[in-house]
């Protein structure tokens, strides 16, 4: 059903990284506008992005209220300039999104190595604890706050003169690794949620190498 001059949205897709969550869809509107609604499985529908000509809607504010809930969205199509018009069944045309559970599905953003410090044959590598848009008591939570021990980091490290990458893992944001004295090392980290079956890993952080600005060397 629907009015003769509107088409239903299609290819509804969730795009989410570190809980910043946008619903995208097609087609680009021609003589029509869209409104999005979102709800949890048991909740009421809430309207967002009223009568927009965009083909995306930022739903972050809604999903961060409870990132472990499962959400459903729908996109309504209305004729441009006649948004009260309804389809033959008395309702505007709409299409449902796939279900989306932020805690299980949001992509992990690219991590950043905050610092590294060498003390003798040990190097301490610290990963930046990225802030998310999830709030508790009016403060924004970090990725570690949200995921706790579910989130681990894998460190890849290698001698500047070699290609083989050793690995280390931590469920904090710090690594303490053994290195050979007098050798320069490079580092890259990856965020991982091992309990997931999809979207388990982030892209790798930019590579940081000893002898560059971020690090500090102390001879003991």
């Amino acid at each position: 059903s629907g009015t003769t001059n509107t088409v239903a949205a299609y290819n509804l897709t969730w795009k989410s990284t570190n809980f910043k969550t946008i619903l995208e869809w097609e087609p680009k509107p021609v003589n029509q506008v869209y409104t999005v609604q979102i709800s949890t499985k048991s909740g009421d529908w809430k309207s967002k992005c009223f009568y927009t000509t965009d083909t995306e809607c930022d739903l972050t504010d809604e999903i961060v209220k409870d990132v472990k809930q499962t959400y459903l969205a729908r996109v309504f199509s209305y004729p441009a300039g006649n948004v009260e018009s309804t389809g033959s069944a008395g309702e505007p045309l709409y299409e449902n999104s796939p279900e989306f559970t932020p805690y299980l599905e949001t992509n992990l953003g690219q991590p950043t190595i905050q610092s590294f410090e060498q003390v003798g044959t040990k190097v301490n590598v610290t990963v930046e604890d990225e802030r998310t848009l999830v709030r508790r008591n009016n403060t924004f939570l970090s990725l570690r706050d949200v995921f706790g021990k579910d989130l681990i980091y894998t460190l890849y490290y290698w001698k500047s003169s070699s290609s083989g990458k050793k690995t280390a893992k931590t469920n904090t944001n710090e690594f303490l690794i053994d290195v050979d004295k007098g050798e320069n090392y490079c580092f890259s980290v990856q965020a991982v949620i091992p309990s997931r079956t999809v979207n388990r890993k982030s892209t790798d952080s930019p590579v940081e190498c000893m002898g560059q600005e971020k690090g500090e060397f102390r001879e003991i």
């Epitope: 280390a168 893992k169 991982v192 388990r200």
Partner: antibody, heavy 120, light 107 residues
Framework: EVQLVESGGGLVQPGGSLRLSCAAS????????IHWVRQAPGKGLEWVGY????????YYADSVKGRFTISADTSKNTAYLQMNSLRAEDTAVYYC?????????????WGQGTLVTVSS | DIQMTQSPSSLSASVGDRVTITCRAS??????VAWYQQKPGKAPKLLIY???FLYSGVPSRFSGSRSGTDFTLTISSLQPEDFATYYC?????????FGQGTKVEIK
């Protein structure tokens, strides 16, 4: 169902080459790390090397460094072990195994293995 | 590289016996030790991870423990299907390393 299937084993002369494949199903290899482990006849398990298919990073055991190369084709969901300059002591059953990359991260799934025999 | 020294290399036991296999790491590996069971002509199967956690589907007669750098696999009451070779493995650092294996045979 998670499955790893190795293929490509066989008889090869010393100094020869062979490429083993590890075809994965039931999961996406780029979400995990893939290891190769070998077992000489009547002997124990020896780790050969790993690849992280998401970035191509690898590391090898000293015994195969410079001779073996691990690669992955994420579009085929398959990892490979290219073995060059083969020696009699490389004769073994070769297994690929999945590493869930958790803190406790052992190898949770293994293939059935493929036998490589290096002999003249 | 971290060495995993496993003992004994073989043992004979009867059905119903309590069996203990030990592995000593050459340096600290925290709890990053796994135990595998392997039967002839088959791939290894994961039994215990993180030193003491039973992998899904593994019978509760298998257990693991840690004391410092010493790790123990215990089979509380040996069953006919438990005759196999057992390996410990550390995955704390690269490269991961295996113990030499313990063959459990029928007495």
């Amino acid at each position: 169902e998670v499955q790893l299937v190795e293929s490509g084993g066989g008889l090869v002369q010393p100094g020869g080459s062979l490429r083993l494949s590890c075809a994965a199903s039931g999961f996406t290899i780029s979400d995990y790390i893939i290891h190769w482990v070998r077992q000489a006849p009547g002997k124990g398990l020896e780790w050969v090397g790993y690849i992280d298919p998401s970035n191509g990073y690898t590391y090898y055991a000293d015994s195969v460094k410079g001779r073996f190369t691990i690669s992955a084709d994420t579009s085929k969901n398959t990892a490979y072990l290219q073995m060059n300059s083969l020696r009699a002591e490389d004769t073994a059953v070769y297994y690929c195994a999945r590493d869930p990359q958790s803190l406790t991260s052992p190898f949770d799934y293994w293939g059935q293995g493929t036998l490589v025999t290096v002999s003249s | 590289d971290i060495q995993m020294t496993q003992s004994p290399s073989s043992l004979s036991a009867s059905v119903g016996d309590r069996v203990t296999i030990t592995c000593r790491a050459s340096q600290d590996v925290n709890t990053a030790v796994a135990w595998y069971q392997q039967k002839p002509g088959k791939a290894p199967k994961l039994l215990i991870y993180s030193a003491s956690f039973l992998y899904s589907g593994v019978p509760s007669r298998f257990s693991g423990s840690r004391s410092g750098t010493d790790f123990t696999l215990t089979i509380s009451s040996l069953q006919p299907e438990d005759f196999a070779t057992y390996y410990c493995q550390q995955h704390y650092t690269t490269p991961p390393t295996f113990g030499q294996g313990t063959k459990v045979e029928i007495k």
